[in-house]
């Protein structure tokens, strides 16, 4: 038949950053294509990335629509050219994602730091509300938007004179912090939901110091 | 489940150093924040200072900075605390304490460290 | 640094009672306080998570409300097993402080 050298597909991913969603799998295929569907589980199945040769699909489109919501995927093999064709038992090849639930599993993106101001020994660090791709009401939602209180900054700041670091938490996008007068200092924050159990962590922004151009100092 | 194993007891001189380790089960120490937290017989707790295992970055009370260092290998999921020129006042029980971000929500069982001559 | 005023030291209270203790920060914690419980002998337990959240496997009895610069934790009704120690935490920023402790002893 037809369909001898098809291949399952097999390793299937979720890659999520800030809900930027893409499943990615394996093999490469060889005279081989892939159709993608995705549902809740309570949903019905929605095909995505017809045919392709790709061995990934992005999936944001669909996952952002709840993003509380627990998605499964699954990868259908079809012989190249012959996408009419049905495994032994009467339907194409299939492989199961594992489950993803995009408001507890995607990634944190690496954070930035937008600005910093000092006024006398007080120093305001402001985050980046990063923009995401889950819309509400035709507007895309912020990072904050999104998780609310559930998501917290951790600052890291330190003398550039010295190595001993301070640190400060948030649940806002800001910071206001005591800083030695005559000092510079240098800055990284870190986006963390303390409720999770994993993907609980951003990795760290760019250092931000004092005295150069994303600050502004005033008396 | 969420376990922390603190080292054992440990009796030392004045002027020398200590290093007590606290080794992580059940979760991955990179996802949190940890730390150790000082308590003298029948006083309270005390911070001494934590440690980003997913990045290095240590902080510490500055009562104790230039004394203590924590670091963590998350090889083998162990943190370490330091104390080096130890007085008679660090005799106490150092306990290691996993930060959630929102409390310390797991604690080790305590090392007791006696500095005496 | 952040200085954690914690009241009253010690109190004796009855089976039953309602207890309060309270925390005043010397500036705003944004909830970043939380509160433990320590037996002699023991490692400290969490009992309050950012300042009104119930630590897993901790009693309904035990609550916590505060905001800003004051908190407050609240024993619904005093229990045997809960005659021991208790500490206030601020964790927003570093160093950390715990509160001096109030210790609760059976009247």
């Known amino acids: 038949s037809g369909t001898t050298n098809t291949v399952a597909a097999y390793n299937l991913t979720w890659k999520s950053t800030n809900f930027k969603t893409i499943l990615e799998w394996e093999p490469k295929p060889v005279n081989q294509v892939y159709t993608v569907q995705i549902s809740t589980k309570s949903g019905d199945w929605k095909s995505k990335c017809f045919y392709t040769t790709d061995t990934e699909c992005d999936l944001t489109d669909e996952i952002v629509k709840d993003v509380k919501q627990t998605y499964l995927a699954r990868v259908f093999s079809y012989p190249a050219g012959n996408v009419e064709s049905t495994g032994s038992a009467g339907e194409p090849l299939y492989e199961n994602s594992p489950e993803f639930t995009p408001y507890l599993e995607t990634n944190l993106g690496q954070p930035t730091i937008q600005s910093f101001e000092q006024v006398g020994t007080k120093v305001n660090v402001t985050v980046e509300d990063e923009r995401t791709l889950v819309r509400r009401n035709n507007t895309f939602l912020s990072l904050r938007d999104v998780f609310g209180k559930d998501l917290i900054y951790t600052l890291y700041y330190w003398k550039s004179s010295s190595s001993g670091k301070k640190t400060a938490k948030t649940n806002t996008n800001e910071f206001l912090i005591d800083v030695d007068k005559g000092e510079n200092y240098c800055f990284s924050v870190q986006a963390v939901i303390p409720s999770r159990t994993v993907n609980r962590k951003s990795t760290d922004s760019p250092v931000e110091c004092m005295g150069q151009e994303k600050g502004e100092f005033r008396e | 489940q969420v376990q922390l194993l603190e080292s054992g007891a440990v009796l030392a001189r004045p002027g020398t150093s200590v290093k007590i380790s606290c080794k992580a089960s059940g979760f991955n120490i990179k996802d949190y924040y940890m730390h150790w937290v000082k308590q003298r017989p029948g006083q309270g707790l005390e911070w001494i200072g934590g440690d980003d295992p997913a990045n290095g970055h240590s902080m510490y009370d500055p009562k104790f900075q230039g004394r203590v260092t924590i670091t963590a290998d998350t090889s083998t999921s162990t943190v370490f605390m330091e104390l080096s020129s130890l007085r008679s006042e660090d005799t106490a029980v150092y306990y290691c304490a996993r930060d959630s971000g929102y409390a310390m929500d797991y604690w080790g069982q305590g090392t007791l460290v006696t500095v005496s001559s | 640094d952040i200085q954690m005023t914690q009241s009253p030291s010690s109190l004796s209270a009855s089976v039953g009672d309602r207890v309060t203790i309270t925390c005043k920060a010397s500036q705003d914690i944004k909830s970043f306080l939380s509160w433990y419980q320590q037996k002699p002998e023991k490692a400290p337990k969490s009992l309050i998570y950012y300042a009104t959240s119930l630590a897993d496997g901790v009693p309904s009895r035990f609550s916590g409300s505060g905001s800003g610069t004051d908190y407050t934790l609240t024993i619904s009704s005093l229990q045997p097993e809960d005659f021991a120690t208790y500490y206030c935490?601020?964790?927003?920023?570093?160093?950390?402080?715990f509160g001096g402790g109030t210790k609760v002893e059976i009247k």
């Open positions: 935490l601020q964790h927003g920023e570093s160093p950390y402080t």
